[in-house]
Amino acid sequence: LKGQEFAPSHQQVYAPLRADGDKPRAHLTVVRQTPTQHFKNQFPALHWEHELGLAFTKNRMNYTNKFLLIPESGDYFIYSQVTFRGMTSECSEIRRAGRPNKPDSITVVITKVTDSYPEPTQLLMGTKSVCEVGSNWFQPIYLGAMFSLQEGDKLMVNVSDISLVDYTKEDKTFFGAFLL
Amino acid sequence: LKGQEFAPSHQQVYAPLRADGDKPRAHLTVVRQTPTQHFKNQFPALHWEHELGLAFTKNRMNYTNKFLLIPESGDYFIYSQVTFRGMTSECSEIRRAGRPNKPDSITVVITKVTDSYPEPTQLLMGTKSVCEVGSNWFQPIYLGAMFSLQEGDKLMVNVSDISLVDYTKEDKTFFGAFLL
Amino acid sequence: LKGQEFAPSHQQVYAPLRADGDKPRAHLTVVRQTPTQHFKNQFPALHWEHELGLAFTKNRMNYTNKFLLIPESGDYFIYSQVTFRGMTSECSEIRRAGRPNKPDSITVVITKVTDSYPEPTQLLMGTKSVCEVGSNWFQPIYLGAMFSLQEGDKLMVNVSDISLVDYTKEDKTFFGAFLL
C-alpha cells in the first residue's frame, strides 16, 4: 500500500510507512572462541554473545549458530570491529634470518550466505599486514557499510586467525546490523 | 499509540510514526585540548566544538562539558575517530636498550554515563600498540556501533593520552551520534 | 505539512513523514584506476563501480564522473574504506641511511564540492604514517560520519597516492552514503 493513500498527496511517500522502533536490529559482542572444526580454505567464523551486557537482537533479527538472520528484505548497515593481539610477528623472525619477507597478516571478512547460492558473498574485508618489531602487538580492524539484503540472508564474521582475537571485553570486538 | 490506529491494518507499524528530520543528531569536531585536571586511573575526556564548521547538534541533542546528552530513549548509532600523532615511541627506546618490550599504545573509548549508575559503561574501545621505528608517527582510530540508550544518558570520548591527539583539522578527529 | 495534521496530536512528528525505502542511497565499489590528469596540490579522486556486484545507487542518488550527487537536502551518513598496499616504505630506506626520518604516509579524504563555493570542503580525513620494516605492507583506512548536505552537493574520495590503492576486490575498497 502506498503511503499517500492515507496521507496528503503532496507528501513524498512511495512505500508503506514504518515506525523506526520496529526495525530489525542487532549488536553482538565477543565471547571466548572455543576450538571448532571449520572448512578448509575458509576463514573460521566467530560466535557471539547476543543477550548479555551491551548485546541485543530485536524485531525478528535473530542470532543462531554464528549467523545473524535477516528477517526482512531491505538496505542494512552492517558493521564489525575485531581487535587482534599477538606476540612477535613472524615477520621479524623472517627478517632476522635474512630471508625474503612475507609479512604476517590479520583479516576480517563480513560474509553473506544465501541458501539459494552455493557460494558465500564477501561483503566487507579489512586486511592488514602485521610487521611490528615489538614483542607484543594489538590492534583493531573496523568495517562498516550498507548492503541490500534479502529476507533469509545470513551474516557472519570470519577472521584469518581465531586464536589472535581479543575476546576479553565486549567493547573491543563486536558485530552489528540494522535496517535503514 | 500504535501506528495502525490511523493507518491501514496491514501496514506493519508497532510504534508512533516519526519524521526523520526530527531525530536527535550531533556531529562534534576536535578543538585543542589544554592541560586540565582529570580523575586518576581514568582516561581523560576530550572536549569538542559543537557549532562551528562541520559541527552541529540538533533536535534536543545537546553538548555540554565534554558530554553529549541523550534527550530521548532509543537505539543510537555512535561513532568517533581520533587521530593521534607522536614522536619515536618508547617501544623503540626500550628495544634499543635491550629490555623486554612493553609497547606504547593509543586507546579511544566511547563511554556512557548514567546518573543512576555509579560506574560509567564502556561502549566502544579501539586500542592499538604503537611500535613505529620512524621518529614521527600518526594514525587514526575509528569506532562506530549501535546502542540502546536511555533519556538522560551522557556520552563522552576518552583517550589514553590527550597530548597525542591531532587537533589541527575538524575532519581528522570527531565524535557523533544519531537516533536510528 | 506537519505530520500531526493527519495523525493523532500527541504523536511527535514535526516534518512530513517519509518512507525509508524511498531515501537516496549508494554503495560504490572499487575499480582499477586509470592514470588521469589531476590538479596540482590536490589529491587525486577515485572513480568507482556503481552498478555491478555489490554496488548500487537508488532513489535519485546518482554517480557520475567520480562524484556522488546529492539529490535532496538532509543529514547523510557517509563512509569509505580504502585498502592500500605497497612495498618497503621509504621510511625504512631513510632510516638505513641514517638520515632524519620523515615517514611515508597514506591518506584518504572524503570531500564535498558545492558549485556555489570556490573551495571543496574536506569532510573526513584518515591519515597514517607507514613505516613498516617488512618489504610488503597492506592496510585499510576506514572513515564514516554524518553531515548535513544540500541538494546539488557532490561527494568524492581523494587519496594521497592512487597507485597504492588495492583495486582487486569490491569488499576491500568502497564508498557509500545514505540519507538518514
Epitope: - | 592541560p35 586540565t36 581523560p44 593520552d161 597530548s163 589541527t168 | -
Partner: antibody
Framework: QVQLVQSGAEVKKPGASVKVSCKAS????????MHWVRQAPGQGLEWMGW????????NYVQKFQGRVTMTRDTSINTAYMELNNLKSDDTAVYYC???????????WGQGTMVTVSS | DIQMTQSPSSVSASVGGRVTITCRAS??????LAWYQQKPGKAPNLLIY???SLQSGVPSRFSGSGSGTDFTLTISSLQPEDFATYYC?????????FGGGTKVEIK
C-alpha cells in the same frame, strides 16, 4: 591554575653535574609531556628533549644524548633534568614547559639559571 | 633537523604600527608552527599554535598565517607591552626547533 615551579639558580664547575627540578600543579601531571628548553645568555631558545611522565619514556636531542637524563617522580608531580659533564657553554637558563609530544608548550616554568665557571 | 629561519632579526616600530615577522622552515611542516613572545628575564609565552590559532587570553591584534614552509606573525596595532622578542617553533618532527628570534623595539 597550571603552575610549573623550578628549583633555584646553581653555580657549577666544569665537569660537574646539575639537576634541575620542576614541580607541576593545577593539571594532571601524567597527562602531558614535560619539555626542557634552554637559553644561553643573549641567545635564542634551544629544545633539549622531553619526558613522558606517565611512563618515564624520554626523547633527547642528539646533541645532548649521553649527557642528559630526564626523570620524574609522579608521587610529587615533579620532573627533573640532569646534565652531566658540564662545560662553560652550558651556562644558560633552563626551562621546563608542558604540552604535547609534538606541540606548542602552553605553560612554562620561571627558569633556572645554571652558571658553569671555574 | 628542520631549520627555522626567522626574519628580520630585529625591527623598530611605533606604538599603533603594524609589524610582520616571517618564519621559514627548511621543509614542509604542515601547520605545526607556534609563536612565542618573550620579555627580558621572563619565560616565553605562547601566542599562536597550529600556525593561526590564537591561544586563549592573547589579544586579537596578534595573528598567524601560513602553512607548509612559510609562516607569518602579524601584530596589527602595536601596544607598549608588545615590545619583546618573538620566536617561532616547529612541532612537526623530532627534534623540535626554534627560529633565531625577532626583537621588536620602540622606534
Amino acid at each position: 591554575q597550571v603552575q610549573l615551579v623550578q628549583s633555584g639558580a646553581e653555580v657549577k664547575k666544569p665537569g660537574a653535574s646539575v639537576k634541575v627540578s620542576c614541580k607541576a600543579s593545577g593539571y594532571t601531571f601524567t597527562g602531558y609531556y614535560m619539555h626542557w628548553v634552554r637559553q644561553a645568555p643573549g641567545q635564542g631558545l634551544e629544545w633539549m628533549g622531553w619526558i613522558k611522565p606517565k611512563s618515564g619514556g624520554t626523547n633527547y636531542v642528539q646533541k645532548f644524548q649521553g649527557r642528559v637524563t630526564m626523570t620524574r617522580d609522579t608521587s610529587i608531580n615533579t620532573a627533573y633534568m640532569e646534565l652531566n659533564n658540564l662545560k662553560s657553554d652550558d651556562t644558560a637558563v633552563y626551562y621546563c614547559a608542558t604540552g604535547g609530544s609534538q606541540d606548542a608548550s602552553d605553560f612554562w616554568g620561571q627558569g633556572t639559571m645554571v652558571t658553569v665557571s671555574s | 633537523d628542520i631549520q627555522m629561519t626567522q626574519s628580520p632579526s630585529s625591527v623598530s616600530a611605533s606604538v599603533g604600527g603594524r609589524v610582520t615577522i616571517t618564519c621559514r622552515a627548511s621543509q614542509d611542516i604542515s601547520i605545526w608552527l607556534a609563536w612565542y613572545q618573550q620579555k627580558p628575564g621572563k619565560a616565553p609565552n605562547l601566542l599562536i599554535y597550529a600556525a593561526s590559532s590564537l591561544q586563549s587570553g592573547v589579544p586579537s591584534r596578534f595573528s598567524g598565517s601560513g602553512s607548509g614552509t612559510d609562516f607569518t606573525l602579524t601584530i596589527s596595532s602595536l601596544q607598549p607591552e608588545d615590545f619583546a622578542t618573538y620566536y617561532c617553533q616547529q612541532a612537526d618532527s623530532f627534534p623540535l626547533t626554534f627560529g633565531g628570534g625577532t626583537k621588536v623595539e620602540i622606534k
